[in-house]
Structure formats: C-alpha cells, structure tokens
C-alpha cells in the first residue's frame, strides 16, 4: 500500500543478527516490519521496540521508534510495523502549529464567553461569545471565569504513520 513518509531518525544500520529474520523481497520491495539488505536480495526484520517500517519499502534502515516526551503518555508501544503513539497528558494539548510540545489548556473562558468545547489532547478549551456565538480567538484572557475543563479521550499519535 502507499506510504506516508514518517520523519523519524533512522536506526543504526542493522547487520542481520541471529534474531533478525530474513525473507526474500517481493517484486523488489520488503513488507512492513522489514528493510531491504544492501544487495537487495533479502528483507531483514526490524527490531521490536527499537525500530519499525509501516509500508512496503526499499529502506536500507528501519525507522527509529519515537520515545514519548515528558508531558506525554504512551498510548501504544512501538512495534515492528507501527511507531509509538504518544498523547499529551491530561490538561494539556498539542496544536498543529506547534506539534513539538504539549501546552497547558486554559482553565476557563474570558468574561462574557461560554465554554462549548473541552480540553482534549489536541485542542484547548473552546469558548464562544454568549450573545453572538462567535468563537474566541484563543489569546490568554485578562480575566477568566473559572470554568473547569475535562480531558478528552481519543488518541492523538505523536508520529503519524499513515
């Protein structure tokens, strides 16, 4: 299948150790969970928990597994075919604009606004004007009403692997 090119560091090149299974490439490519040998004649398995590949490929290295940062929780571990899935801790979120770090969710909405969306691992609380219903732009308000936000549940992978 088609592959999303993840931007992980490469694992150090693996010479086939005894635990690394070898198989022949199919039509010149290797299946998920493997990389190709330098001579193109073998597919060598990635190392569980260390590196991975998500799609049919001719990678000479498997891709290094992501380690969740402090401030993140690991939702699912790295396997030979899927990268680690990390999620911001409760009360924090990761914006598309700044995916490198989790930011604290606001604790409440500015005066004259009402909360319509909770803090989730990928978005801050959402506030709208009471009368007009227009969204608040997201800048930190000078005065806040104390509206408690609750964390969302869906997973947000820290490295999407297609």
């Amino acid at each position: 299948e088609s592959a999303l090119i993840t931007q992980q560091d490469l694992a150090p090149q693996q010479r086939a150790a005894p635990q690394q299974k070898r198989s022949s490439p199919s039509e010149g490519l290797c299946p998920p969970g493997h990389h190709i040998s330098e001579d193109g004649r073998d597919c060598i398995s990635c190392k569980y928990g260390q590196d991975y590949s998500t799609h049919w490929n001719d990678l000479l290295f498997c891709l290094r597994c992501t380690r969740c940062d402090s401030g993140e929780v690991e939702l699912s571990p790295c396997t030979t075919t899927r990268n680690t899935v990390c999620q911001c801790e409760e009360g924090t979120f990761r914006e598309e604009d700044s995916p490198e770090m989790c930011r604290k969710c606001r604790t409440g909405c500015p005066r004259g606004m009402v909360k319509v969306g909770d803090c989730t691992p990928w978005s801050d609380i959402e506030c709208v004007h009471k009368e007009s219903g227009t969204k608040h732009s997201g800048e930190v308000p000078a005065v806040e009403e104390t509206v408690t936000s609750s964390p969302g549940t869906p997973a947000s992978p820290c490295s999407l692997s297609g």
Epitope: Q13, S26, L29, D39, G40
Partner: antibody, heavy 119, light 106 residues
Framework: EVMLVESGGGLVQPGGSLRLSCAAS????????MSWVRQTPEKRLEWVAT????????YYPDSVKGRFTISRDNAKNTLYLQMSSLRAEDTAVYYC????????????WGQGTLVTVSS | DIVMTQSPSSLSASVGDRVTITCKAS??????VAWYQQKPGKAPKLLIY???TRHTGVPDRFTGSGSGTDFTLTISSLQPEDFATYFC????????FGQGTKVEIK
C-alpha cells in the same frame, strides 16, 4: 540500451488532473522497481513515487500521498503517474527512473516531461 | 526527512583543475549515497553509488568517498564535458537530494 521516454506533460489548472506515461525499452521492464522523480523550476530534485516490479506495492512521500497514483502495465512496458488535485507547487519536470540491480538507487532516468500548474 | 546539504552551490574552474564537491547528511546514512551529473535540458546521469562505486562507463577521474554523514565527489582533472550540475542523493531512507553544485568554466 536502456531507454525511458516520458509523455503526457502540459499546462493544467490548479485542482486539475493529468496522467503521465513512461515507455521503457532496452531492458526487462517487469524485473525492475520503478519510480517517478521531479525537478522543480529551482532545480531541486524530489522523489515522487515508487512501484514494485510487478505493480503490487507502491509508496509515496507526504507531499503527494492521496493525490498521485503510480501504476504500471508490464505487458506494454509502460509506467504511469496519475496526478490529481494539482497545485502550483507540483510544477516541475517529471522523470521516470529505474532502480538499478543490487544498488537500491536510480541508475537510469528518462528525459522528462514538463508539468505546469497555473491558472 | 534526511537533509543533504551540498557545497558549494556553484564553482568556477578550468580544464585540468581538480574539483571537490561535498555533501553532508543530517544523519548517518552509512554509504547509501549516489552522485549524479546533469547537463542543461538533460536527465541526471548516475556517476557514483554506494558512496564510492563508479557506475558503468564512468571515467576514473570521478571518485566518490565518505561514509556516515560526510561525502565527497572529486573530479581529478576537469574535462570540457564535465561542466554541468552535480547532485548528491541519499537512499538509506527513501530518497532525498542535495541542492546541486553547478561547475562552470572560469
């Protein structure tokens, strides 16, 4: 002599579609992994898509995934690139390229076909 | 993605000169580096693969070296037909290219 001849390029509007072809000769086409690589007007080279020798497996970079589809017809010795939802940044010369024997990189390229995305 | 930083972006040289072009990978790529020559309006032509192996028919004045992150293409004695643009490429993780080095006549 290895020969790769691309065709199908032209001027297309943003959001439009185009299908490129690459006719191969001088080697056993069905035995080789093939790719498309493009060269931007600034002369930057970018890998676009790869397909396995039998056509069963394909992969793409993020920049084109979901918009471009690589395919091949081994009976006709032809490689294709179907491009849709084209953007201005897809403007480039598109080359088809063969992955060499035991080298895991491109050894022969075609002469290229120019795709211009503009309104 | 692995970034390949090539230098210089252009250089002027005379026939008979020794020319060196360097390429630096943003992370270890082993020896999975190729060098290509491109002339105006033409397709890139493979010169070197596996960092130092000359492709079929490539004159021995072209030499590649390096491993890990630092790679060099050397033309020992520049010939008139060598004035062109040269690109490095890593192929350890998908394919990424350097920005090119244009070798011009001084």
């Amino acid at each position: 002599e290895v020969m790769l001849v691309e065709s199908g390029g032209g001027l297309v509007q943003p959001g439009g579609s185009l299908r490129l072809s690459c006719a191969a000769s001088g080697f056993t086409f069905s035995s080789y992994v093939m790719s498309w690589v493009r060269q931007t007007p600034e002369k930057r080279l970018e890998w676009v898509a790869t397909i396995s020798s039998g056509g069963s497996y394909t992969y793409y970079p993020d920049s084109v995934k979901g918009r471009f589809t690589i395919s091949r017809d081994n009976a006709k010795n032809t490689l294709y690139l179907q491009m849709s939802s084209l953007r201005a940044e897809d403007t480039a010369v598109y080359y088809c390229a063969r992955r060499g024997d035991s080298m895991i990189t491109t050894d022969y390229w075609g002469q290229g076909t120019l795709v211009t995305v503009s309104s | 993605d692995i970034v390949m930083t090539q230098s210089p972006s252009s250089l002027s040289a005379s026939v008979g000169d020794r020319v060196t072009i360097t390429c630096k990978a943003s992370q270890d790529v082993g020896t999975a580096v190729a060098w290509y020559q491109q002339k105006p309006g033409k397709a890139p032509k493979l010169l070197i693969y596996w960092a130092s192996t000359r492709h079929t028919g490539v004159p021995d004045r072209f030499t590649g070296s390096g491993s890990g992150t630092d790679f060099t293409l050397t033309i020992s004695s520049l010939q008139p037909e060598d004035f062109a643009t040269y690109f490095c490429q890593q192929y350890s993780s998908y394919r990424t290219f350097g920005q090119g080095t244009k070798v011009e006549i001084k």
